[in-house]
């Protein structure tokens, strides 16, 4: 499998972590989240060429079958391999609450 | 969130489990796998419209940001939520061995 940074399509074009700045309004959270007001959303974006950051055997199979049947089988997809935690302060009927989310911000990426 | 089977794009067009029949040659396994000669590969294929089978909070964020910035943020992607194990009979230097793979066949799917 290729090294995660060795993208055959050119630097930065393959599956990797990107940061997108989003307001509560962008996320549709303005009516239930108080803080933070803006989130630096880390997400996985980019192409998954042959065996690039293949997550597992399934990803390798998908690559092989996509090569054979590109109209039937899609290429592997760039998705989070793990997440970073985040705390949100939310509005509740009685005031505010602290809520912890472990599946909100991507930490690193792979192809599957 | 929509029910997993309630695809707004029409029946069978959203993220779901598909089976693709593949030979050892198709998979590039002919030189190291003896059996099975053919694999019923279960994989996740289909579109991920708004909140359809959203895996977690990250998938929900991705949907919101894709709607806002479709050229920057891709839609969520249909990937395995879990796997079924599979046994392969492999060639070895000394003969054959039985090997179980836990990450080869998709069991069910979600969008992320």
């Amino acid at each position: 499998a290729r090294n995660g940074d060795d993208c055959p399509l050119g630097p930065g074009r393959c599956c990797r972590l990107h940061t997108v700045r989003a307001s509560l309004e962008d996320l549709g959270w303005a009516d239930w989240v108080l803080s933070p007001r803006e989130v630096q959303v880390t997400m996985c974006i980019g192409a998954c060429p042959s065996q690039f950051r293949a997550a597992n055997m399934h990803a390798q199979i998908k690559t092989s079958l996509h090569r054979l049947k590109p109209d039937t089988v899609p290429a592997p997809c760039c998705v989070p391999a793990s997440y970073n935690p985040m705390v949100l302060i939310q509005k509740t009927d009685t005031g505010v609450s602290l809520q912890t989310y472990d599946d909100l911000l991507a930490k690193d990426c792979h192809c599957i | 969130a929509r029910n997993g089977d309630d695809c707004p794009l029409g029946p069978g067009r959203c993220c779901r489990l598909h089976t693709v029949r593949a030979s050892l040659e198709d998979l590039g396994w002919a030189d190291w796998v003896l059996s099975p000669r053919e694999v019923q590969v279960t994989m996740c294929i289909g579109a991920c419209p708004s909140q359809f089978r959203a895996a977690n909070m990250h998938a929900q964020i991705k949907t919101s940001l894709h709607r806002l910035k479709p050229d920057t943020v891709p839609a969520p992607c249909c990937v395995p939520a879990s796997y079924n194990p599979m046994v392969l009979i492999q060639k070895t230097d000394t003969g054959v061995s039985l090997q179980t793979y836990d990450d080869l066949l998709a069991k069910d799917c979600h969008c992320i």
């Epitope: 935690p85 302060i89 912890t100 | -």
Partner: antibody, heavy 118, light 107 residues
Framework: QVQLQQSGPELVKPGASVKLSCKAS????????INWVKQRPGQGLEWIGW????????KYNEKFKGKATLTVDTSSSTAYMELHSLTSEDSAVYFC???????????WGQGTTLTVSS | DIVLTQSPATLSVTPGDRVSLSCRAS??????LHWYQQKSHESPRLLIK???QSISGIPSRFSGSGSGTDFTLSINSVETEDFGMYFC?????????FGGGTKLEIK
């Protein structure tokens, strides 16, 4: 750059009240939450409460309910903490801390020393 | 309330030493643990967030690890400017609580 400037030291009598201030500069006041933290001499840190500057919503540590009142004045970019019915146990350094992510405290004021003594 | 217990209370080290400071939570707090340094007569300074994430402007010799109930702050080669108090803080649930602190002093 983000700065939190706290009011000067206070010497007050038991039973009285005092209002400490924390003036923010270098950022949009409503973009950061303000927390207040107590530190008694030679001791650890205690979280008193949190306030959302945009509309003044606050959350208190149960231990400080009735003891502390948090308010903000957005026109002057200033957060306030009023402490009531003071006793010697309230003698401490009080910090305001600005938080972008509400989980932790990124920016701290220099602290205000409160001495309660007759 | 979640209780954070730091150990040791005092750590005497020589510049150049590698040190590890411990923070133990009374219940699982996932990764919701942050570390601060406080020098005498100064405000605390954030060193590490979410157990292991680095902070811009903080020297790379500071690192954090752990999850659940056991956390460690490591300084891989202590410098003279590192001496002072170190506190951990949890944000898993309100009220936020801090550990009692570890004093890092020169041997």
């Amino acid at each position: 750059q983000v700065q939190l400037q706290q009011s000067g030291p206070e010497l007050v009598k038991p039973g009285a009240s005092v209002k400490l201030s924390c003036k923010a500069s270098g950022y949009t006041f409503t973009s950061y939450d303000i927390n207040w933290v107590k530190q008694r001499p030679g001791q650890g840190l205690e979280w008193i409460g949190w306030i959302y500057p945009r509309d003044g919503i606050s959350k208190y540590n149960e231990k400080f309910k009735g003891k502390a009142t948090l308010t903000v004045d957005t026109s002057s970019s200033t957060a306030y903490m009023e402490l009531h019915s003071l006793t010697s146990e309230d003698s401490a350094v009080y910090f305001c801390a600005g938080t972008y992510d509400p989980a932790y405290f990124d920016y701290w004021g220099q602290g205000t020393t409160l001495t309660v003594s007759s | 309330d979640i209780v954070l217990t730091q150990s040791p209370a005092t750590l005497s080290v020589t510049p150049g030493d590698r040190v590890s400071l411990s923070c133990r939570a009374s219940q699982s707090i996932s990764y919701y643990l942050h570390w601060y340094q406080q020098k005498s007569h100064e405000s605390p300074r954030l060193l590490i967030k979410y157990a292991s994430q680095s902070i811009s402007g903080i020297p790379s010799r500071f690192s954090g690890s752990g999850s659940g109930t056991d956390f460690t702050l490591s300084i891989n080669s202590v410098e003279t400017e590192d001496f002072g108090m170190y506190f951990c803080q949890q944000s898993n649930s309100w009220p936020y609580t801090f550990g009692g602190g570890t004093k890092l002093e020169i041997k």
